[in-house]
């Protein structure tokens, strides 16, 4: 009879050590939750703050209304310019108007001084009809100056404060642009 | 990695139309552009058209007005719709994916614009 109590007695003994395992494990899960959700809440906060933060344009670019744009560093010919843009989902400098073409040179002469820089003008080769990149027409005030008499593809670039034309194959540097990036406030 | 799969290549007479689709899969978060590239034999490999994340559109001046680019971001997928096609555009038309760092290119779909 003593034997059994004694084993019944082992049992509840082994049962208790059971759940105070099950109850530490608990304990521990519980916390690690909470750590996790504190981390959690944590990145959330740090995410939104730098989102709130993140300027409208990338560094070495420059903003003006909702457009950033970028003066490059390297001469290219104006197809590869073009490409040089698109690898950072940008585009050539599309002039919309007077007053961006004013801000453009204006930054340009604080920046660089006097040189070429290639925009995304061409000319249609069957039509002689200047386009921009995406297919608009520039407004009547910003067309390029006769300059060019070349017979191969004719493309548009900015020095000064002039829009002027030019071989789409000599080197000259770029300017590209995309949108900025709007604040959600 | 990002993968590129042309369709809608074929034979066209000039002045005729055709479209072209790209899909895309991968890590399309990398990609800056999506672009429409073209190649005839022993010339080099030359934009067409393109299109950024930011949806801003640039064209070849030889194709300016004729072609139009588009994208279905739900799809991830690019077309390039293809008007008064003439002999000269004759080419393998090549998807790309462009990022600071690299392209991604598809395999090539062949167009051919002949009477």
């Known amino acids: 009879k003593l034997l059994q109590v004694s084993t019944i007695a082992m049992q509840q003994q082994e049962k208790l050590i059971q759940q105070e395992r099950a109850l530490l494990n608990f304990t521990e899960w519980k916390r690690s939750c909470a750590l996790q959700m504190k981390y959690c809440q944590a990145f959330m906060q740090n995410s939104l703050s730098s989102a709130h933060n993140s300027s409208p344009c990338p560094n070495n670019w420059i903003q003006n209304r909702e457009s950033c744009y970028y003066v490059s560093e390297i001469w290219s010919i104006w197809h590869t310019s073009q490409e040089n843009c698109l690898k950072e989902g940008s585009t050539l400098l599309q002039i919309e108007s007077k007053e961006e073409m004013d801000f453009i040179t204006g930054s340009l002469r604080k920046i660089k001084g006097s040189y070429d820089y290639w925009v995304g003008l061409s000319q249609d080769g069957h039509s002689g009809r200047w386009l921009w990149q995406d297919g608009s027409s520039p407004s009547p005030g910003l067309l390029p100056a006769e300059r060019s008499q070349s017979a191969n593809q004719v493309c548009g670039y900015v020095k000064s404060n002039s829009l002027l034309s030019s071989n789409c194959s000599t080197w000259k540097y770029f300017i590209c642009e995309k949108y900025a990036l709007r604040s959600s406030v | 990695q990002v993968q590129l799969q042309e369709s809608g290549g074929g034979l066209v007479q000039p002045g005729g139309f055709l479209s072209l689709s790209c899909a895309a899969s991968?890590?399309?978060?990398?990609?800056?552009?999506m672009a429409w590239y073209r190649q005839v034999p022993g010339k080099q490999r030359e934009l067409v058209a393109a299109i950024t994340s930011g949806g801003r559109l640039a064209y070849a001046p030889s194709v300016n007005g004729r072609f139009t680019i588009s994208r279905d971001y739900a799809k991830n997928t690019i077309h390039l719709q293809m008007n008064s096609l003439e002999p000269e555009d004759t080419a393998v038309y090549y998807c790309?994916?462009?990022?600071?760092?690299?392209?991604?290119w598809g395999q090539g779909t062949q167009v051919t614009v002949s009477s």
């Open positions: 991968g890590s399309m978060h990398s990609v800056n552009s």
């Open positions: 790309a994916a462009l990022n600071s760092a690299t392209t991604y």
